[in-house]
Interface confidence: low
């Protein structure tokens, strides 16, 4: 069967197309090409008589067509109007006619697109931006790229106008990116240059650094304020509510206790019309903001009840601190047998009694900080039991031999565990 194949089927403007004939019959008188789906003398392109090898142009001949002896037709320098059907009419030697129709489509070579925007400086959480891919081209498909990736799925992104317009609703700073559009048709694909979206935002809540609260007299106070903002924020400082200066950094040399107070950083973005503040408390003091952990020293840790006395000393290198003592979570002294001396550094128990057995610890503190010692265990024996009757297994105290005192050691074992639990809780 006579057939026509278009090579290629989709043709770019300015290029050429070959209408290739298959299964051409033998013993031909001649053939003619027509524009359209039927034989119409008014639309004849060219005729060819085999005997004379003569080609005759018809009314639809444009000068761009070439006919080959095998009946194929080449059309050069294709224009948009060439789109459509072409019919080959074959006249055999027996004057019996045969026809076949083929077709092709013509598309323009796409120009490089560009992006127009309705808002070049949108404000975060407030504005929308519409990007439009120019120019509008018939039969073109429009695609969008963000940072060279295909569009993410988001309820804030909307495509319209045949995908030619991309709208971002309620822009955020994360929408600040490179945007490109691409146009495609069957014969070409072109991508635009990047447009970088600049979203205005902020200021966010300012951060004052460094984070220190406590300063010693004579030190230099240097504070810096930063708030994420586009365009960058303008900064001002207030001390105890009074305006000081319009700078990002605040510097006060050789501070005194009079410089203690509340320091406010005010950040303003004149374009977005937003402002934010952060307040920081500064304390200028001779006191140490970090009190070191004290240590307890005992004159002895195992004593004989109603006979021995004991001195516990709370050692610290810090100055300007106070000391307090604790026994079984109770503040000391708790009886007349207990005495504090040397500014509470030493706790004396004289004489020691059964109820004094257990854990002791001291705490050092100043108005702005405190720290506790590790606990110390005081063992109280009666009947002058020899020391070797006490054994230590896995930090638990047991009584070996003797009689009538197991309850006391069991109580001491419980106290020891309480002390260990307290110690782990606080450290």
């Amino acid at each position: 069967k006579l057939t026509i194949e278009s090579t290629p089927f989709n043709v770019a403007e300015g290029k050429e197309v070959l209408l290739l004939v298959h299964n051409l019959p033998q013993h031909l008188f001649g053939y003619s090409w027509y524009k359209g789906e039927r034989v119409d003398g008014n639309r004849q392109i060219i005729g060819y008589v085999i005997g004379t090898q003569q080609a005759t142009p018809g009314p639809a001949y444009s000068g761009r067509e070439i006919i080959y002896p095998n009946a194929s037709l080449l059309i050069q320098n294709i224009i948009q109007n060439d789109t459509g059907f072409y019919t080959l009419h074959v006249i055999k030697s027996d004057l019996v006619n045969e026809e076949a129709t083929g077709q092709f489509r013509v598309y323009p070579e796409l120009p490089k697109p560009s992006i127009s925007s309705n808002n070049s400086k949108p404000v975060e959480d407030k504005d929308a931006v519409a990007f439009t891919c120019e120019p509008e081209t018939q039969d073109a498909t429009y695609l969008w790229w963000v940072n060279n990736q295909s569009l993410p799925v988001s309820p804030r992104l909307q495509l319209s106008n045949g995908n030619r317009t991309l709208t971002l609703f309620n822009v955020t700073r994360n929408d600040s990116a490179s945007y490109k559009c691409e146009t495609q048709n069957p014969v070409s694909a072109r991508r635009s240059d990047s447009v970088i979206l600049n979203v205005l935002y902020g200021p966010d809540t300012p951060t004052i650094s460094p984070s220190d609260t406590y300063y010693r007299p004579g030190a230099n106070l240097s504070l810096s304020c930063y708030a994420a903002s586009n365009p960058p924020a303008q900064y001002s400082w207030l001390i105890n509510g009074t305006f000081q200066q319009s700078t990002q950094e605040l510097f006060i040399p050789n501070i005194t206790v009079n410089n203690s107070g509340s320091y406010t950083c005010h950040a303003n973005n004149s374009v977005t019309g937003c402002n934010r503040t952060t307040v920081k408390t500064i304390i200028v003091t001779e006191l140490s903001p970090v009190v070191a952990k004290p240590q307890i020293k005992a004159s002895k840790t195992t004593v004989t009840g109603d006979k021995d006395s004991v001195n516990l000393t709370c050692s610290t290198n810090d100055t300007g601190i106070s000391i307090r003592w604790f026994f079984k979570n109770q503040s000391l002294p708790s009886s007349e047998r207990m005495k504090l001396s040397q500014g509470n550094i030493t706790l004396s128990i004289n004489p020691v009694k059964r109820e004094d057995a257990g854990t002791y610890w001291c705490e050092v503190f100043n108005p702005i900080s405190k720290n506790q010692s590790d606990p110390i265990m005081l063992n109280v024996n009666y009947n002058a039991l020899p020391q070797e009757n006490l054994i230590n297994v896995d930090e638990q105290l047991y009584f070996q031999g003797g009689s009538g005192l197991n309850d006391i050691f069991e109580a001491q074992k419980i106290e020891w565990h309480e002390a260990r639990a307290h110690h782990h809780h606080h450290h």
């Epitope: 070049s120 940072n147 700073r173 600040s176 990116a177 490179s178 240059d193 990047s194 447009v195 970088i196 979206l197 600049n198 979203v199 935002y201 902020g202 930063y226 994420a228 903002s229 586009n230 365009p231 960058p232």
Partner: nanobody, 119 residues
């Protein structure tokens, strides 16, 4: 296609000067902020200088204040980093990076240019 190309790196003696350039194509730098970032082995990445071309805002790391100057020529679509009084600790690969918003990371990076300060 967006492209950033750095140049101007090289070997210089302590106390010497260099001028780094960052030529941009595929976008207009007047709507962006540009940072110079350096990376040295065993050190944290450091944003040494930053300029927002639409406001003229600049910011410098403490380590380069008074020695480095960042600038941009929007007509040439190029940013510069003038480095004076160079020290051994300034040795690094210097990258220029652009962002269209302040303080939130970078959209595009160049390939970097190496600066070596050594006697």
């Amino acid at each position: 296609e967006v492209q950033l190309v750095e140049s101007g790196g090289g070997l210089v003696q302590p106390g010497g000067s260099l001028r780094l350039s960052c030529a941009a194509s595929g976008f207009n730098i007047k709507d962006t902020c540009i940072g110079w970032v350096r990376r040295a082995p065993g050190k944290e990445e450091e944003l040494v200088a930053y300029i927002c071309n639409y406001t003229g805002y600049t910011r410098y790391a403490d380590s380069v204040k008074g020695r480095f100057t960042i600038s941009a020529d929007t007509s040439k679509n190029t940013a510069y980093l003038q480095m004076n009084s160079l020290r051994a600790e300034d040795t690094a690969v210097y990258y220029c990076a652009i962002t269209s918003y302040h303080g939130q990371g970078y959209n595009y990076w160049g390939q970097g240019t190496t600066v070596t300060v050594s006697s």
